[in-house]
Interface confidence: medium
């Protein structure tokens, strides 16, 4: 049967019917419902929400909706022994203590089970010592401290401002520098936009607000006790000493009122330049230790959190495909939140809920997608992408054979300026074509397409008249699908004006003030941006599941491969003498990219011409498209990161949130001038070029005519 015979409705009508069924008012209602109490991973409240979503997805019309549970390592503060930081005098008396909780927002004063701010997976400990201010605690910040300023962090407690990079990278860098504790704080320079009031009168962070978050360095492992395998009822668990990615020093987050008290007394070295100064009225001295009058005072951390194996629940809904039920298009986003989850994740979960409802409505009218659509409500994303990773580990054999695409659906908004898309190059044309068909919600773009407003507000740096699309990094649930399994992935949300707003993320991220009211009053009162994101995410899923030929363009991969090869070559060419000495050549990589480009071009020509009424040939061509992303997977993984297996993209070793191209070569070249054995270091560069060239060539050959 052709797709149309199987689905009874013309394809164009299907897409329009699906999009027209999506309603802003429903998303608003769902967001309200999901944000009235906290839904922390591993709690009864989040289990109840999982069962509610299961029940509603069944009502909406999905074929089946199941809970998938796992027993994973989570982390919680001790309810009777709170975490805090003090300044102690020479007698050991606590002369200042940081706050034990955030002042609750209006209307939420009587809500129970608000977890106080903490750094998930911090070990217990009560270190005391001198403070060193380390800016954002990035790799380059520690280079500045240690190499240029000759400041030793060994045995010190470091204080770092949130922003720029994933907090787990900050903690890893501090550990490597020898620190014995880490204090993380939100500086107004990064979390308070000028001219905007703090919550509840605006969307800025108040002084008592604190960002929660995990501080793991999992590198894609999932549950720290069962790397590579699902944390099921018969799992073999590692001992805590062998667990993956746990920090070894105590860590705790604070707000800027408390940070002021710690930073105002800092002495020692002045900040090296203006980029180390935030917006507090303090000198931003680096230390170590306090100035003159306060030099005998120390900082002491009191951390009593515990790591506990706890049950988590994913909700997995299935809408069976009519023609290719063994091909899966997945829409997934997480359900667990740090507190109310007004933006993260429930602005995304509400959109997924409405997408499921719309698909269900079409199904009740007799329609089915060509391919199977799986919907997922992931648990324990905030604790290290645990729910999605465990489910993918349990189902890896099915996914690697049947997975067409994964669309992520965490926070729908991080601003209300323009669209932001990160995806595989295979999806560029899909995103372009879809956004040309959608209406822009932006003021001043009435009657114009989303593509037009997006392109105007966020132009591509390389191609005039096209919008910017970024590389996938990590820090969200697409990680296991893309970086480990090689399933084509993408994500979309509305974002802020990156060019004019210098703060990191959105100010109230992971704080108690991330409420329904934050969204309804300040970000999206009409829920028009949420609706647009629903149309983009839902539209992508619809096309991926329903188009007869998969909407992937392999030529776009060829273009970026050339760009990435140019980039990594020019990084290497900063060392021309060593390149010559060690006979380092990129010829094999450029040759492979050239071959890929030619073969992709020929494949695209065949794709236009083949007989689409022949189901065997159609399936063959689609399989070549589906398996192209898979072809970039190296089964051995990247050095010391076995679960990051994609050779073209990986999360940056210096910032989990950012994507790095040709990561194996990039990491081999990073700081190579400081390596003690240059011959060995350049040998590794050559090996990584070989791996990359081989992989690109092998991927190209999957697009060649099969016989």
């Amino acid at each position: 049967k052709s797709s149309n015979e199987a689905t009874n409705i013309t394809p164009k009508h299907n897409m329009k019917a699906f999009l027209d069924e999506l309603k802003a008012e429903n998303i608003k209602k769902f967001l309200y419902n999901f944000t009235q109490i906290p839904h922390l991973a591993g709690t009864e409240q989040n289990f109840q929400l999982a069962k509610q979503i299961q029940s509603q997805w069944k009502e909406f019309g999905l074929d089946s909706v199941e809970l998938a549970h796992y027993d994973v390592l989570l982390s919680y503060p001790n309810k009777t022994h709170p975490n805090y930081i003090s300044i102690i005098n020479e007698d050991g008396n606590e002369i200042f203590n940081t706050s034990l909780f955030e002042p609750p927002p209006p209307g939420y004063e009587n809500v129970s089970d608000i977890v106080p701010p903490f750094s998930a997976f911090s070990p217990q400990g009560m270190p005391e010592g001198d403070l060193v201010y380390v800016n954002y605690a990035r790799t380059e910040d520690f280079f500045k401290l240690e190499r240029d300023m000759k400041i030793n962090c060994s045995g010190k407690i470091v204080i770092a401002r949130y922003g720029k990079v994933f907090r787990g990278n900050k903690v890893k860098n501090a550990q490597l520098a020898g620190a014995k504790g880490v204090i993380l704080y939100s500086d107004p320079a990064d979390y308070f936009a000028p001219g905007v009031k703090s919550y509840p009168d605006g969307w800025n962070l108040p002084g008592g607000g604190v960002q929660r978050g995990n501080i793991l360095n999992l590198n894609g492992a999932g549950d720290p006790l069962t790397p590579g395998y699902p944390a099921n009822e018969y799992a073999y668990r590692r001992g805590i000493a062998e667990a993956v990615g746990l920090p070894s020093i105590p860590v705790h987050p604070i707000g800027y009122y408390d940070a002021q008290k710690l930073l105002e007394k800092m002495g020692g070295s002045a900040p090296p330049d203006s980029s180390w100064r935030g917006s507090l009225k303090v000198p931003y001295n680096v230390g170590p230790g306090f100035t003159g009058n306060f030099s005998t005072q120390k900082v002491k951390m009191h951390i009593h959190s515990t790591n506990e194996v706890t049950r988590i629940y994913n909700v997995i809904g299935t809408l069976r495909g009519a023609v290719e039920p063994d091909r899966y298009v997945i829409l997934g986003g997480h359900r667990d939140s740090w507190v109310f989850g007004g933006i993260d994740p429930q602005s995304g979960a509400a959109v997924v809920h409405e997408i499921v409802r719309s698909f269900g409505t079409l199904k009740k009218e007799g329609w089915r997608p060509r391919r199977t659509i799986l919907f997922a409500s992931w648990d324990a994303e905030e604790f290290g992408l645990l729910g999605s990773t465990e489910w993918a580990e349990e189902n890896s054999r099915l996914l690697q054979e049947r997975g067409v695409a994964y669309i992520n659906a965490d926070s729908s908004i991080e601003g209300n300026y323009t669209l932001r898309v990160d995806c595989t190059p295979l999806m560029y044309s899909l995103v372009h074509n879809l956004t040309k068909e959608l209406k822009s919600p932006d003021e001043g773009f009435e009657g114009k397409s989303l593509y037009e407003s997006w392109t105007k507000k966020s132009p591509s740096p390389e191609f005039s008249g096209m919008p910017r699309i970024s590389k996938l990094g990590s820090g969200n649930d697409f990680e296991v699908f893309f970086q480990r399994l090689g399933i084509a992935s993408g994500r979309a949300r509305y974002t802020k004006n990156w060019e004019t707003n210098k703060f990191s993320g959105y100010p109230l991220y992971h704080s108690v003030y991330e409420t329904y009211e934050l969204v309804e009053k300040f970000y999206d009162p009409m829920f028009k941006y949420h609706l647009t994101v629903a149309q983009v995410r839902g539209g992508m899923v619809f096309e991926l599941a329903n188009s007869i030929v998969l909407p992937f363009d392999c030529r776009d991969y060829a273009v970026v491969l050339r760009k990435y090869a140019d980039k990594i070559y020019s990084i290497s060419m900063k060392h021309p003498q060593e390149m010559k000495t060690y006979s380092v050549s990129f010829d094999s990589l450029f040759s492979a990219v050239k071959n890929f480009t030619e073969i992709a071009s020929k494949f695209s020509e065949r794709l236009q011409d083949f007989d689409k009424s022949n189901p065997i040939v159609l399936r063959m061509m689609n399989d070549q498209l589906m398996f192209l992303e898979r072809a970039f997977i190296d089964p051995l993984g990247l050095p010391d990161r076995p679960f990051y297996r994609h050779v073209i993209y990986a999360p940056s070793s210096h910032n989990k949130y950012a994507g790095e191209s040709f990561p194996g070569i990039y990491d081999a070249l990073f700081d190579i001038e400081s390596k003690v054995d240059p011959s060995k270091a350049w040998g590794e560069v050559k090996r990584q070029i070989y791996v990359a060239a081989f992989t690109v060539q092998a991927a190209a050959e999957t697009l060649s005519e099969v016989a």
Epitope: R420, P461, W498, D566, I568, S570, S661
Partner: nanobody, 119 residues
Framework: QVQLQESGPGLVKPSQTLSLTCTVS??????????WSWVRQHPGKGLEWIGF???????HYNPSLKSRVTISVDTSKNQFSLKLNSVTAADTAVYYC???????????RGQGTLVTVSS
């Protein structure tokens, strides 16, 4: 730490050519993967992208300004430049040079320089 500094005349006569230079310190302008761009902000308005030069030398301009704009680079001086000819009062704006890249975190901008077009 990379820093960018714009320089050039603050006042330009109508029909003449506006010329600005951006000096990059703390990093090489030929660093791979970066785009060196010019943007401007008219009084009370949002940012308008003018154009950029990619590290490998390819140049892209805003279509609406393309006929009047030239962006060039001098790697030996670690500078890149903007020329906008046939200016009118509508070109009065704060002009910024910036560094961009594939990813959102790559964006850096200079302090900006006000250019007034007036006789």
């Amino acid at each position: 730490q990379v820093q960018l500094q714009e320089s050039g005349p603050g006042l330009v006569k109508p029909s003449q050519t506006l010329s600005l230079t951006c000096t990059v310190s703390g990093g090489s302008i030929s660093n791979s993967g970066y785009y060196w761009s010019w943007v401007r902000q008219h009084p009370g308005k949002g940012l308008e992208w003018i154009g950029f030069i990619y590290y490998n030398g390819s140049i892209h301009y805003n279509p609406s300004l393309k006929s009047r704009v030239t962006i060039s680079v001098d790697t030996s001086k670690n500078q890149f430049s903007l020329k906008l000819n046939s200016v009118t009062a509508a070109d009065t704006a704060v002009y910024y040079c910036a560094r961009d890249g594939d990813d959102y975190g790559d964006y850096l901008r200079g302090q900006g320089t006000l250019v007034t077009v007036s006789s």
